[in-house]
């Protein structure tokens, strides 16, 4: 049986959701006028970079779009970007596609996503609405790195 990605809506503790703005992801308040993205999540089959203490290795994509999250260095700083890629194309690759990989770890009822390419760097939202989703190594008050994955039918 062919694997299929799981679908989730994603929120942070301040009820900010992820929204597609052009070809980038931003955080916006959960509201009726805003259409949040549905996140596609699928496990990586290759175990080359696996580290169970950090979580399960997953690819993250945007449902309904051939867009996947990946990490690259820009001016010496790890940066979160969206790349035109079908998540299933990543999944079927025998070799793990490291820039697209994240460690998915559960902390209580929340999920945390850490870059495999840049250990210690986590997907985060700012406390300010309308700001891009980004990578941070500073977990805490000013950045939200814990997310709720809400099942969507």
């Amino acid at each position: 049986r062919e694997a299929a990605p799981k679908s989730y809506a994603i929120r942070d503790s301040r009820q900010m959701v992820w929204v597609l703005s052009g070809n980038s992801l931003i955080a916006a308040p959960l509201s009726r006028s805003i259409k949040p993205v549905t996140l596609h999540l699928i496990a990586c089959r290759d175990t080359e970079f696996s580290d169970k203490e950090k979580g399960n290795m997953v690819y993250l994509g945007i449902k309904g779009k051939d867009l996947c999250l990946f990490c690259a260095e820009i001016q010496g700083k790890p940066t979160l970007q969206l790349k035109e890629k079908n998540i299933m194309d990543l999944y079927v690759e025998k070799k793990a596609q490291k820039p697209f990989l994240f460690f998915h770890n559960k902390e209580g009822s929340t999920s945390v996503f850490q870059s495999v390419s840049y250990p210690g760097w986590f997907i985060a939202t700012s406390t300010t609405s309308g700001q891009p989703i980004f990578l941070t190594k500073e977990r805490g008050i000013t950045n939200n790195t814990n997310f709720y994955l809400d099942s969507v039918e």
Epitope: P29, S31, P36, S129
Partner: antibody
């Protein structure tokens, strides 16, 4: 049709703990994307949000009451509960439980219990 | 005292139009969180009247409408009827408090 019913003592002594339960019927307390809240209304005054718990078990509390409040869920009984410690006369109010869904009511409350009056007095 | 500010009272004659304002700040209404309105008839529990700024749940007459702009929102009631006499509350979410916030309530009197 979803219905909520508050229950608990109508009289609590000062310094004691107020305990209320909200029984959910016509739906599951673990229903995907649902959140459940406690809201109170002192006699002749406005509504005050006390705290909430959602289907993941995540809780949030009003900062002004946080040190005294605990909200929990009993999935086996399809209930959620409120505990408010060290009560004073200022905690005398009608207490309501309420329901919402993240991607349907957008942080509003669409179903309310009928409310229960709790008086704090010795 | 309330995070959202409403006038304590408004009044109007039957058939008239009245509006109730709700003023918040940049951490709630101004941050683009939705505003919801509740009607509380005497001696009863609040009932959701408007959700998501301007949407009526089924069963709510179209005489009731909501709008939002900047850090404020308003509820309009047209063709005022005696049974509209009630308390009305606005509600939103505040990210700085990580919680739900209510207005102080407005008592509507039908003259």
């Amino acid at each position: 049709e979803l219905q909520l019913q508050e229950s608990g003592p109508g009289l609590v002594k000062p310094s004691e703990t107020l305990s209320l339960t909200c029984t959910v019927s016509g739906g599951s307390i673990t229903s995907s994307n649902a959140y459940w809240g406690w809201i109170r209304q002192p006699p002749g005054k406005g509504l005050e949000w006390i705290g909430s718990i959602d289907y993941t078990g995540s809780t949030a509390y009003n900062p002004s009451l946080k040190s005294r409040v605990t909200i929990s869920v009993d999935t086996s009984k399809n209930q959620f509960s409120l505990k408010l410690s060290s009560v004073t006369a200022a905690d005398t109010a009608v207490y309501y439980c309420a329901h919402g869904k993240y991607y349907e009511t957008y942080l509003g409350f669409d179903v309310w219990g009928q409310g229960t009056l709790v008086t704090v007095s010795s | 005292e309330s995070v959202l500010t409403q006038p304590p009272s408004v009044s109007g004659a039957p058939g008239q139009r009245v509006t109730i304002s709700c003023t918040g700040s940049s951490s709630n209404i101004g941050a683009h969180y939705d505003v919801h309105w509740y009607q509380q008839l005497p001696g009863t529990a609040p009932k959701l009247l408007i959700y998501g700024n301007d949407n009526r749940p089924s069963g709510v007459p179209d005489r009731f409408s909501g709008s939002k702009s900047g850090t404020s929102a308003s509820l309009a009631i047209t063709g005022l009827q005696a049974e509209d006499e009630a308390d009305y509350y606005c509600q939103s979410y505040d990210y700085s408090l990580s919680g739900y916030v209510f207005g102080g309530g407005t008592k509507l009197t039908v003259l």
